[in-house]
């Protein structure tokens, strides 16, 4: 069964600045990643960022950098000030849209306990939603 | 209701310019590429530019370096500069709404460019 | 770029009959891939998305099928308002490729 996993990371120097990583582990041919804030895609989440293999990227402030990690992972550096500024229990949530498996999404979030910089091993999250 | 009304059709002679319009409304249209579409009447369709959210701008080889796509957010409003126009460029353009990656869902209703002289 | 085949370019049909469309990709687009109805005079309408999805408000006689490079558009049984020109519409590359168009006519 497919799976996606997601880390949430604050950088030390910034501690505005988050980095979000999110990965497919599955066979099929990833053709849509999506990233949102403040929970599902479609479900009362914010997209910050959408990444097409051929069409390129999308992305919305705070979104500074998102980028193709692998064939089948990302990466998206998020900075801000004020409203727009994530914190440290934000839910960052990755949908995958992979052929033909169809739509995988996994949330997560800030490790409660990590020091600035520092991360929980990007294991699997829990999968919230299969289409 | 989503809606996206183009405007700014018209006749122009060969080499003349014109500008389109399109008004949108009814969703957030920040968070969506725009496209133009047109159709040369009783013809196919055939895309002519794509614009994201933040700019980015895509050509058919055919209208590159004479049209230019452009976009107003704060106003919900889509454009395209049309310089250097030929007779092949009469058709019946349309504004078209899509969710980046997901296709084109909404379109507008046209508006009808004729080059002639 | 990629090139959509589409076939028939025409065909007639009485209400009640089934009809396929198909349209044929130069080049893997996996389903990015959606399927338009146009009536004379007026802007065309997606039926279907990511090659097999229905779009919302769109009677369930219609369905797409296939991925890669084979597409095909179904009407189970067709009704007197589906007589109209039916397009396909790859958007996985840039330039956006649209197929030639097939229209339905009355037998």
């Known amino acids: 069964t497919p799976e996606v996993w997601v880390q949430v990371r604050m950088e030390a120097t910034e501690l505005s600045s988050f980095t979000i990583r999110c990965g497919f582990l599955g066979s099929g041919s990833i053709s849509l990643v999506t990233v949102s804030w403040g929970g599902p895609n479609g479900a009362g989440g914010t997209t910050l960022a959408v990444l097409h293999p051929e069409r390129g990227i999308r992305q919305w402030a705070p979104a500074r950098q998102a980028r193709w990690e692998t064939q089948s992972s990302i990466s998206l550096i998020l900075e801000g000030s004020g409203a727009s500024s994530p914190c440290a229990n934000t839910t960052f949530c990755c949908k995958f849209a992979s052929f033909p498996e169809g739509s995988w999404e996994a949330c997560g979030s800030l490790p409660p306990s990590s020091d600035p910089g520092l991360s929980a091993p990007p294991t699997p999250a829990p999968i919230l939603r299969a289409d | 209701e989503v809606q996206l009304v183009e405007s700014g059709g018209g006749l122009v002679q060969p080499g003349g310019s014109l500008r389109l319009s399109c008004a949108a409304s009814?969703?957030?249209?920040?968070?969506?590429?725009m496209h133009w579409v047109r159709q040369v009447p009783g013809k196919g369709l055939e895309w002519v530019s794509d614009?994201?959210?933040?700019?980015?701008?895509y050509y058919l080889g055919s209208v590159k370096g004479r049209f230019t796509i452009s976009r107003e957010n704060a106003k919900n409003s889509l454009y395209l500069q049309m310089n250097s126009l030929r007779a092949g460029d009469t058709a019946v353009y349309y504004c078209?709404?899509?969710?980046f990656g997901n296709g084109m869902d909404v379109w507008g209703q046209g508006t009808t460019v004729t080059v002639s002289s | 770029d990629i090139q959509m085949t589409q076939s028939p370019s025409s065909l007639s049909a009485s209400v009640g009959d089934r009809v396929t469309i198909t349209c044929r990709a130069s080049q893997g687009i996996r389903n990015d891939l959606g399927w338009y109805q146009q009536k004379p005079g007026k802007a065309p309408k997606r039926l279907i998305y990511?090659?097999?999805s229905l779009q919302s408000g769109v009677p369930s006689r219609f369905s797409g099928s296939g991925s890669g490079t084979e597409f095909t558009l179904t009407i189970s049984s067709l009704q007197p308002e589906d007589f109209a020109t039916y397009y396909c519409?790859?958007?996985?590359?840039?330039?956006?490729?649209f197929g030639g168009g097939t229209k339905v006519e009355i037998k």
């Open positions: 614009i994201g959210n933040s700019g980015e701008t």
């Open positions: 078209v709404r899509e969710e």
């Open positions: 009814g969703f957030t249209f920040r968070n969506y590429d």
């Open positions: 990511a090659a097999s």
């Open positions: 519409l790859q958007h996985n590359n840039y330039p956006l490729t």
